[in-house]
């Protein structure tokens, strides 16, 4: 997270980290006791999922292995459209004050809405500095028309843009698949942006979760 600050302790109990061994790979969110939602480009063969602590490496955190993941069937490695994936935990997460389910959206929030993006990704770019504490930054949803002025044809209609004019506030490496939460509901998953991260007036691009709630629910049901 560029130009952010540590999240208020325990304010993101649905935030998870996807680890490769002990190394941060991506962010994600807990949908229920068995399922994590993240970005399709975060796919690996096996995941270790960190839950229940704002601090990576905290021994009090839950760590659960996951071996099965289900990409959206329309994900394209060329255009990066439909960049979302469900990861099935090998054992159930224990819900607590620090481990809660995220609220999936019942509607798409409008441009101008203030949202929070969070993650353990690098706080500097292009040289990397990985924090141990979960970082947060507030950004505003940007209309597709305004975002298209920056990204032209790269923007697809299930992509959502967020940023602050003339500001560096953005996600970065390691934040992928993590949550953009607006008014208490999950509206986006970190997907992509320009590099180095935090170039003013280059918005972050997110998978627009409100367009995929049916696929999320159907997929969890199908692979119970």
């Amino acid at each position: 997270i560029i130009d952010g600050a540590p999240c208020a302790r325990g304010s993101h109990p649905w935030q998870v980290a996807l680890l490769s061994g002990n190394q941060l790979h991506c962010g994600g969110v807990l949908v229920n006791e068995r399922w994590v939602l993240t970005a399709a480009h975060c796919k690996m063969n096996e995941y270790t999922v960190h839950l229940g602590s704002d601090t990576l490496g905290d021994r009090r955190a839950q760590r659960i292995k996951a071996s099965k993941s289900f990409r959206h069937p329309g994900y394209s490695t060329q255009t990066h459209v439909n960049d979302l994936m469900l990861v099935k935990l090998n054992s159930q997460a224990r819900l607590s004050s620090m481990v809660k389910k995220v609220r999936l959206p019942s509607r798409c929030e409008p441009p101008g809405t203030t949202c929070t993006v969070s993650g353990w990704g690098t706080t500097t770019s292009p040289d990397v500095t990985f924090p141990s504490d979960l970082m947060c930054v507030d950004v505003k949803l940007i209309s597709p028309q305004d975002c298209t002025k920056v990204y032209k044809d790269l923007l697809e209609n299930s992509m959502l843009c967020a940023g602050i004019p003339d500001s560096k506030k953005n996600a970065c490496n390691g934040d992928s698949g993590g949550p953009l939460v607006c008014r208490g509901t999950l509206q986006g998953l970190v997907s992509w942006g320009t590099f180095p991260c935090g170039q003013p007036n280059d918005p972050g691009v997110y998978t627009q979760v409100c367009k995929f709630t049916k696929w999320i629910n159907d997929t969890m049901k199908k692979h119970r």
């Epitope: 490769s20 399709a40 796919k43 990066h80 960049d83 992928s176 590099f195």
Partner: antibody, heavy 122, light 108 residues
Framework: QVQLVQSGAEVKKPGASVKVSCKAS????????IHWVRQAPGQGLEWMGS????????NYAQKLQGRVTMTTDTSTSTAYMELRSLRSDDTAVYYC???????????????WGQGTMVTVSS | DIQMTQSPSSLSASVGDRVTITCRAS??????LNWYQQKPGKAPKLLIY???SLQSGVPSRFSGSGSGTDFTLTISSLQPEDFATYYC??????????FGGGTKVEIK
């Protein structure tokens, strides 16, 4: 330090296969994509394809589709490029390169291997 | 696929000269164009990314400009170590990543 180190020069007969390796060090291998670019003697640069080190997702140049395979071994932070049914016009220096970006999209090559000369001759 | 056309294909210049190389895309690529320098027997090296951003460690005599279809690499005062071949590439419509044909800068 941050680097990509490639395997040594190869001489192959037409119809044979070659497998070039590219070992990454000094950065988290699984966080970036590896691309392969070749350069025939006295010619320009030609993009061959790419692989995501974490997911194994590949994209290949259309003209090489069916002849090229890119793989990675995350345990050794090594990328491989295999080219089959070699022809004389595959004679080139083969480079691996790291793509810089974040998330699903990358924007430029910020680190290159030293190159591997592959000569195809009968 | 997007074609990238570089011009000139070669040029002769003297130390201290201002040198300009152009790269034209067959369709708009916004500002997703990069410039690389390659010396004989060596791998290419990134100079400019995003059409105009100077890569860390690259001397400030190198600059890039342009957006859409027309781009320029300028060396404000050519130094002996700048004699090399220069390539552009585009990352807007990928795959494939496409390169320009190269511009060889030789000593006059």
């Amino acid at each position: 330090q941050v680097q990509l180190v490639q395997s040594g020069a190869e001489v192959k007969k037409p119809g044979a296969s070659v497998k070039v390796s590219c070992k990454a060090s000094g950065y988290t291998f699984t966080s970036e994509g590896i691309h392969w670019v070749r350069q025939a003697p006295g010619q320009g640069l030609e993009w061959m394809g790419s692989i995501s080190a974490s997911s194994g997702d590949t994209n290949y140049a259309q003209k090489l589709q069916g002849r090229v395979t890119m793989t990675t071994d995350t345990s050794t932070s090594t990328a491989y490029m295999e080219l089959r049914s070699l022809r004389s016009d595959d004679t080139a220096v083969y480079y691996c390169a790291r793509a810089a970006g974040y998330g699903a999209r990358h924007w430029y090559f910020d680190l290159w291997g030293q190159g591997t000369m592959v000569t195809v001759s009968s | 696929d997007i074609q990238m056309t570089q011009s000139p294909s070669s040029l002769s210049a003297s130390v201290g000269d201002r040198v300009t190389i152009t790269c034209r895309a067959s369709q708009s690529i916004s500002s997703y164009l990069n410039w690389y320098q390659q010396k004989p027997g060596k791998a290419p090296k990134l100079l400019i990314y995003g059409a105009s951003s100077l890569q860390s460690g690259v001397p400030s005599r190198f600059s890039g400009s342009g957006s859409g279809t027309d781009f320029t690499l300028t060396i404000s005062s050519l130094q002996p170590e700048d004699f090399a071949t220069y390539y552009c590439d585009q990352w807007y419509s990928t795959p494939p990543i496409t390169f320009g044909g190269g511009t060889k800068v030789e000593i006059k």
